[in-house]
């Protein structure tokens, strides 16, 4: 009997109660490998889950999350809510980014604004909860005495062609 069962292909199960050994999986069930003694119940994508791929006799349904949620865990076993830009998801729900931090995505955590002065630059555009600061030229470059003229091109040595 074991040998006969191993001949049952995916999409069927080995039915010991019938003379025809390999029986097709009943509706809403599947077997993804051959030689199965039972078919598995198809996953149902309900509530915050939506169907990404329908169940077939040989493969389980695949779920996704409805708008406003994103998948977590193996095979999208959980749906975690999205937050708005300018927020981060905590264990107690979506919270606004603290001053000095931002999040430009619907998931993830708030990150500190770039410290422009560490690169010797100045803040060109202030940061918000949703956007990082934009760094501009260094403060020295913006001082009244600084020339904004284009510096002269370096002189070429005779006999050298331009790079």
């Amino acid at each position: 009997l074991q040998d006969l069962c191993s001949n049952c292909p995916a999409g069927t199960f080995c039915d010991n109660n019938r003379s025809q050994i390999c029986s097709p999986c009943p509706p809403n069930s599947f077997s993804s490998a051959g030689g199965q003694r039972t078919c598995d119940i198809c996953r149902q994508c309900k509530g915050v889950f939506k169907t990404r791929k329908e169940c077939s006799s040989t493969s389980n349904a695949e779920c996704d999350c409805i708008s406003g949620y994103h998948c977590l865990g193996a095979e999208c076993s959980m749906c975690e809510q999205d937050c708005k830009q300018g927020q981060e998801l905590t264990k107690k729900g979506c919270k606004d980014c603290c001053f000095g931090t931002f999040n430009d995505q619907k998931r993830g955590i708030c990150r500190p604004w770039t410290n422009c002065s560490l690169d010797g630059k100045s803040v060109l555009v202030n940061g918000t909860k949703e956007r990082d600061v934009v760094c501009g030229p260094s403060p020295a470059d913006l001082s009244p005495g600084a020339s904004s003229a284009t510096p002269p091109a370096p002189a070429r040595e005779p006999g050298h062609s331009p790079q």
Partner: nanobody
């Protein structure tokens, strides 16, 4: 391979109790905080409780405070959730999760591994 396997779910009447277990393997259990979360059929993920690696710090969602107790037994590499005075709104799939550090937090998720879940149904 890091693995978390939940058990203990089932059907219980309102006011009843259940104890969920989560068997951990593939990592040093006492070195990491652990968390329980749940997902009801029509809702997104809801944090339930977190316990530190040492077991001395615990946090609970307001919705379960005073009714649920999280605990751990490092000799058995097992996390527990004792659920008392169960209500219909506690019906959900319960997942245990490993956090990335030993320190417990009631703010950030630091989860890097999830279990497959166990179903709790509270109904008369």
């Amino acid at each position: 391979e890091v693995q978390l396997v939940e058990s203990g779910g089932g059907l219980v009447q309102p006011g009843g109790s259940l104890r969920l277990s989560c068997a951990a393997s593939g990592f040093t259990f006492s070195s990491f905080a652990m968390t329980w979360v749940r997902q009801a059929p029509e809702k997104g993920l809801e944090w339930v409780s977190t316990i530190s690696g040492s077991g001395d710090t615990t946090y609970y969602a307001d919705s379960v405070k005073g009714r649920f107790t999280i605990s751990r037994d490092s000799s058995k590499n097992t996390l527990y959730l004792q659920m008392n005075s169960l209500r219909a709104e506690d019906s959900a799939v319960y997942f245990c999760a490993k956090e990335a550090t030993a320190m417990a937090s009631d703010y950030y998720y630091g989860v890097d591994v999830w279990g497959q879940g166990t179903t709790v149904t509270v109904s008369s």
